[in-house]
Amino acid sequence: RGVFRRDAHKSEVAHRFKDLGEENFKALVLIAFAQYLQQCPFEDHVKLVNEVTEFAKTCVADESAENCDKSLHTLFGDKLCTVATLRETYGEMADCCAKQEPERNECFLQHKDDNPNLPRLVRPEVDVMCTAFHDNEETFLKKYLYEIARRHPYFYAPELLFFAKRYKAAFTECCQAADKAACLLPKLDELRDEGKASSAKQRLKCASLQKFGERAFKAWAVARLSQRFPKAEFAEVSKLVTDLTKVHTECCHGDLLECADDRADLAKYICENQDSISSKLKECCEKPLLEKSHCIAEVENDEMPADLPSLAADFVESKDVCKNYAEAKDVFLGMFLYEYARRHPDYSVVLLLRLAKTYETTLEKCCAAADPHECYAKVFDEFKPLVEEPQNLIKQNCELFEQLGEYKFQNALLVRYTKKVPQVSTPTLVEVSRNLGKVGSKCCKHPEAKRMPCAEDYLSVVLNQLCVLHEKTPVSDRVTKCCTESLVNRRPCFSALEVDETYVPKEFNAETFTFHADICTLSEKERQIKKQTALVELVKHKPKATKEQLKAVMDDFAAFVEKCCKADDKETCFAEEGKKLVAASQAALGL
């Protein structure tokens, strides 16, 4: 089976059940349902999944049985529309059920909520978790899939199966350990952090496909796969790009069974043809399916072939550039992007796409000019400032990070971004700026050759979080503009924003700066978030405050928290000292 199956199946549901096996089938249907109906209780979803699974088994037994010929969207949509509380729980999403496929599925997709109103997941005591795991392992793992899927409605479903496998392995090992907590908690922290990163990366892929189209996603994939597999031929890269695009289109479109099946086929193809693709795949290809697919997706770049010729000769100096371009524009541009990317693992994907766009724009203009060759002869000179801009930005920010450390670097970014887009909600500014700040510890440790791809491509992922959160409740024209004009220029667009001079400062509200003794029992991370929330609010009240003023207020605030957390009567300390702090801060900032 290739990724594109030409053979027709009488029953699509039977076909996928047989391909994936019962365990994966049930897990993927649960993920799909939880990603669509994010507010439904776990038990309701399990009931729906069991009904679908029983139906699939009847179709496996007899593909001609009643309704077995229906599409998966029809079957799943019909099942979702049986939920009794649809109108009360989801409001207008219930109107989707009046539509026919494919409009009904599109309607469900449009109602996916990137920031659902769900309680934060609180981790129970280790013994409680281990007991639950031993009492009913299957329910315990299903609950994990459900809770992640409903909070991350675009999570890459086959990858979530991989996370669930690791989650199970962690409990299997650690619940037998002498010190269960020491064994389990670091593993759960790692899974949580990796899961958040995986969710955000996939969200960018889906945004790329849904907001900018297949061509944008394919261009991204050509650049990335050419960097990763520089020894592979262009046709090989093109085939992988086509197949990868199909996989992600399916997952982003809610077609999770097809997506997981096709991803498995793609991994199989890559491993069968690794000699033509990359020398780095050997270890990945010896692993079981879920690990294999994950490993391939994360595999390091292969070594660049020796003696790659200069690109200038055929893409700039040749008199045939316009003839070649006119004959097959997308192939020619694809080849340019492939050739440039495989020579530049040191560039971010978004930079490579900016260069390719500049090249395309130049050819469009010059090939219509009187002397095309004269017109495009200097096109590579136009690349220089595009390359230097992210290089300089990363250099400056890494220096700042090394000087400040992560927490204070995040604070600098909080101030910077609040001044740029003060209309954005405080929780969003805190979340996004904290994540932007993590670029320092993630990327600045790398040598120069790895810094840009690490930093700028990570920033693209984080800024996409800002874009999808802002899209739900748009409040800033500047954010909308940077998010929608160009996918590859989002980061330079945000970088170029200055202080928003049109912003009317927020009214001062003492309640915003009132703190209680509960802050003392918070984890270091939660305490930081409290302080950073206060910092954003300060900037919203006083956008023209200087760095020095803000630093003084924040230092006073840190001292105040430390003092009151050591006090015998903490609550009284917070009440009395808090009033003094607010008054002193107002005076310092001239509020």
Epitope: A235, N273, L308, P309
Partner: nanobody, 125 residues
Framework: EVQLLESGGGLVQPGGSLRLSCVAS????????MGWFRQAPGKEREGVSS????????FYTNSVKGRFTISRDNSKNTLYLQMNSLRAEDTAVYYC??????????????????WGQGTLVTVSS
Amino acid sequence: EVQLLESGGGLVQPGGSLRLSCVASGNTYLTSCMGWFRQAPGKEREGVSSIYTVGGSTFYTNSVKGRFTISRDNSKNTLYLQMNSLRAEDTAVYYCAAGSPARCRLRDPTTFDYWGQGTLVTVSS
């Protein structure tokens, strides 16, 4: 219509060298992926080396890496294969082929659209 004409084959001793040439006429950007294939008696046709005539990137099958060099002269519409350190197992009919860079794969002869008639290379003492 693209036409390909090979030359340069012949008899050579083990360890010797040969240079094959392939003149292309009528080719365009969509046939700018060019390659050399070979077929030994009773065996399947296999890819030896390919080149993008726009971009200049080259690819080789493992058995000839370090011994064979593919090159092109766009001004003469000619493709070359310099073969050094020849071995008895290199004996075969060598074919020049052309196709679209978006499709051509050295390991799959069916992805090349145009073929020459072939030139025989015999390595024997």
